[in-house]
């Protein structure tokens, strides 16, 4: 950018023509004060653009800084700007006029600004007081400016002599502002609703008592404004709130939620987004399942847990063999559903001490007006095992037959054992396993009921012998996955007068 | 339209307590602060108590440690409990919206006497 | 809060009430008579109700605020209360008769 004459700064005669002409790559303009003046813009013969200011019969009102900018900037090395600066001294005008926004200056922290008193002639000595007082501050002065300097929270007033008369400029008034680091927090009543339902949003900013706020969200694409509502916080010093609330939801207020805080003063702010989920309706989802068959001991505490989402909250039911079950005064079973998350829940069903009763089939139902899942399972409960009987018998054919029964769930195993040196059994020697061979001098039976009453299996094992030549010490052990027992009996030959 | 509706004045024994309820409608009650202001006979208004949306609450220096603010999101009404009554707590008690106040109720009357 | 207790002007005047010594924000409330609802006319230091006429405005300059009634008419002739409200409550002035002459 070129401008002509080139400057960078002019006095001129009041009631005189001054023509500024600036020129550029591409289509170029003047700026005063924000503004665009009349102006006449060409392109010229050699392909650059010119712009033609022309002031006429000027006046202390024109006083002040003049840019030349391109037209339309459209890149980095199209945003330059070249600055000019106009002085028309004008005995009738003391300081040049302020917008009464101007006369309030608002300071963070302790940083330098500017009380932009302006004169019209550049050779005038203007100085700065507090208003109360006389004596001049020492502040550099800028013409073009006006006074830069840190000032405290008090009204300033610019002086200067025109002629043989004094000329005060408006009162500038200097505030301090403590502005701290916006802390910003957004949350909402749910972040999940139906269509129909309504959403509230609350934006709360700590330590800033001048905030402005600014909200976004799906709406606005539309052009349908929410009008939010602004308000003090209370208890807690400098704290602000803004609420969004759109009292009917529909599907396409799904989104990002974005509120921006920003101090007036600097514009320095921060914001904070949070998405709304829309649903057409509620649902329920089952996260963690339990399996078809699940395990409890006898006698020990137990616990299952079943994890959904869900939206709105679902009532829950627990079901044994189809009848509602419900917490037990006696404190043998504990049900609860509580909130991981706001769509998440675990509902639990605990058995104090389980007894054999409990065993059966058990249902969890989650369910509201727009859906519902249902777990079924069956609730096994391992029951250690007992050897109930162990007895001998001699039929007239010479055998000898042992007979061991006993319970336990799950089922259990049976295993014999014998051993031929009573002394030694069974700590010093281990006895010999007996299988179900022929070849062996034994034979063996074994049988086994489910009682569904007392949801435990029986085992009756027979182990027959046919001929005992010794003495002889026989083992039934039984035993399932809660561990074992065992018992045992001495059997002697036939021809012995006695058994031990 | 916004209405605030006060119920709950009359005439009130010294050391008793009075309870004021405020029935809201027409806005979404739970997106504002609520609160009561009261006018002495012949006095100018006096702020009494408020309670923010988040269930924040402000009292003024002449019934804290008395006054109790509270409120109904479900049933959009403020309530306001003031133990210990004195003759200077006679007064109109006015029912308000926002902590800035932009809406009055029409107030109620409270005569603390024996 | 200070403001002054009273201010006269003939009707189509403009009228300037001002409030100081509050922080942040300002409101103003008019009442026509004792014992009647008060009325808000400017909240939030510059916001006025839909219902209320434009010919009320506020401002707020620094620490004081400021209620302009242009073109003062009849109807407005009332006690004006000015409040400055924060995160710690809200604290009214002493009230200002305005008197239409």
């Known amino acids: 950018l070129v401008i002509t004459p080139p400057g960078p700064e002019f006095v001129l005669n009041i009631s005189s023509t001054f023509v500024l002409t600036c020129s550029g790559s591409a289509p170029v303009m003047w700026e005063q004060m924000s503004q665009v003046p009349w102006q006449e813009a060409a392109m010229n013969q050699d392909g650059t653009f010119s712009s033609v200011l022309t002031l006429t019969n000027v006046t202390g009102g024109d006083t002040g800084e003049y840019f030349c900018v391109y037209n339309n900037s459209l890149g980095p090395e199209l945003s330059e700007r070249k600055r000019i600066y106009i002085f028309v001294p004008d005995p009738t005008m003391g300081f040049l006029p302020m917008d009464s926004e101007d006369l309030f200056i608002f300071v963070t922290d302790v940083t330098e600004t500017t009380i932009p008193c302006r004169v019209t002639d550049p050779q005038l000595e203007v100085t700065l007081h507090e208003k109360k007082v006389d004596i001049p501050l020492h502040v550099p002065y800028d013409h073009q400016r006006g006074f830069t300097g840190t000032f405290e929270d008090k009204t300033y007033i610019c002086k200067t002599t025109i002629g043989d008369r004094e000329v005060d400029s408006d009162t500038y008034y200097v505030y301090s502002l403590q502005v701290s680091s916006i802390n910003v927090s957004v949350n909402a009543v749910q972040t999940v609703v139906r269509q129909g339902e309504s959403i509230t949003i609350r934006c709360i900013v700590m330590g800033n008592d001048v905030v402005n706020f600014q909200w976004t969200y799906p709406r606005m694409k539309s052009g349908r404004l929410v009008e939010p509502v602004t308000d003090y916080l209370f208890g807690v010093p400098s704290r602000i709130g803004s609420i969004l609330h759109i009292p009917t939801a529909e599907l396409s207020d799904s989104g990002t939620y974005t509120c921006n805080v920003s101090v007036s003063v600097n514009d320095h702010g921060d914001e904070k987004a949070i998405n709304i989920s829309v649903i057409e309706n509620g649902y329920v989802r089952l996260l963690e399942t339990l399996g078809d068959v699940e395990i409890a001991e006898l006698h020990r505490s137990r616990t299952l847990r079943v994890v959904f989402e869900a939206y709105p909250m679902p009532s829950v039911l627990w079901l044994k063999d189809n009848r509602t079950l419900g917490d037990s005064g006696a404190g043998e079973l504990v049900l609860s559903t509580r909130n991981m998350s706001e769509t998440r829940y675990v509902s639990e069903l605990i058995l104090v001490r389980v007894k054999v009763s409990e065993a059966g089939y058990y249902t969890m139902r989650a369910f509201h007006e727009d859906d519902e899942v249902q777990l079924s399972f069956k609730l096994q409960v391992n029951v250690p095992v007992r050897v109930l009987e162990l007895s001998e018998s001699h039929p007239a054919n010479g055998e000898q037959t042992i007979r061991c029964r006993g319970r336990g769930m799950p089922q259990p195993n049976v295993t014999w054992s014998t051993c031929r040196d009573l002394k030694r059994c069974p700590r010093k020697l281990s006895p010999t396993p007996l299988g179900n061979s022929s070849k062996e001098e034994s034979q063996l039976e074994t049988n086994v009921t489910f009682w569904e009453e007392d949801q435990e299996y029986e085992v009756v094992s027979t182990l027959r012998l046919r001929h005992v030549d010794q003495p002889l010490s026989v083992r039934c052990m039984l035993q399932n996955s809660m561990g074992g027992d065992s018992q045992e009996v001495t059997v002697v030959p036939h021809s012995l007068p006695f058994k031990v | 339209a916004v209405t605030l509706d006060e119920s709950g004045g009359g005439l009130q024994t010294p050391g008793g307590t009075l309870s004021l309820v405020c029935k809201a409608s027409g806005f979404t009650f739970s997106s504002y602060a609520m609160g009561w202001v009261r006018q002495a006979p012949g006095k100018g208004l006096e702020w009494v108590a408020g309670i923010d949306t988040a269930g924040g609450t402000a009292y003024g220096p002449a019934v804290k440690g008395r006054a109790t603010i509270s409120r109904d999101n479900g049933q959009s009404t403020v309530r306001l409990q003031l133990n210990n009554l004195r003759a200077e707590d006679t007064a109109t008690y006015y029912c308000t919206r926002s902590s800035y106040i932009d809406t009055w109720g029409h107030g109620t009357e409270v005569i603390v006497s024996s | 809060l200070t403001q002054p207790s009273s201010v006269s002007a003939n009707p189509g005047e403009t009228v300037k009430i001002t409030c100081s010594g509050g922080?942040?924000?300002y409101g103003w409330y008019q009442q026509k008579s004792p014992g009647s609802a008060p009325v808000t006319v400017i909240y939030w230091n510059d916001k006025r109700p839909s219902d209320i006429p434009s010919r009320f405005s506020g401002s707020k300059s620094g620490s004081t605020g400021t209620l302009t009634i242009t073109g003062v008419q009849a109807e407005d002739e009332a006690v004006y209360y000015c409040g400055s409200s924060d995160s710690s409550g809200l604290i009214f002035g002493a009230g200002t008769t305005l008197t239409v002459l």
């Open positions: 922080t942040y924000n």
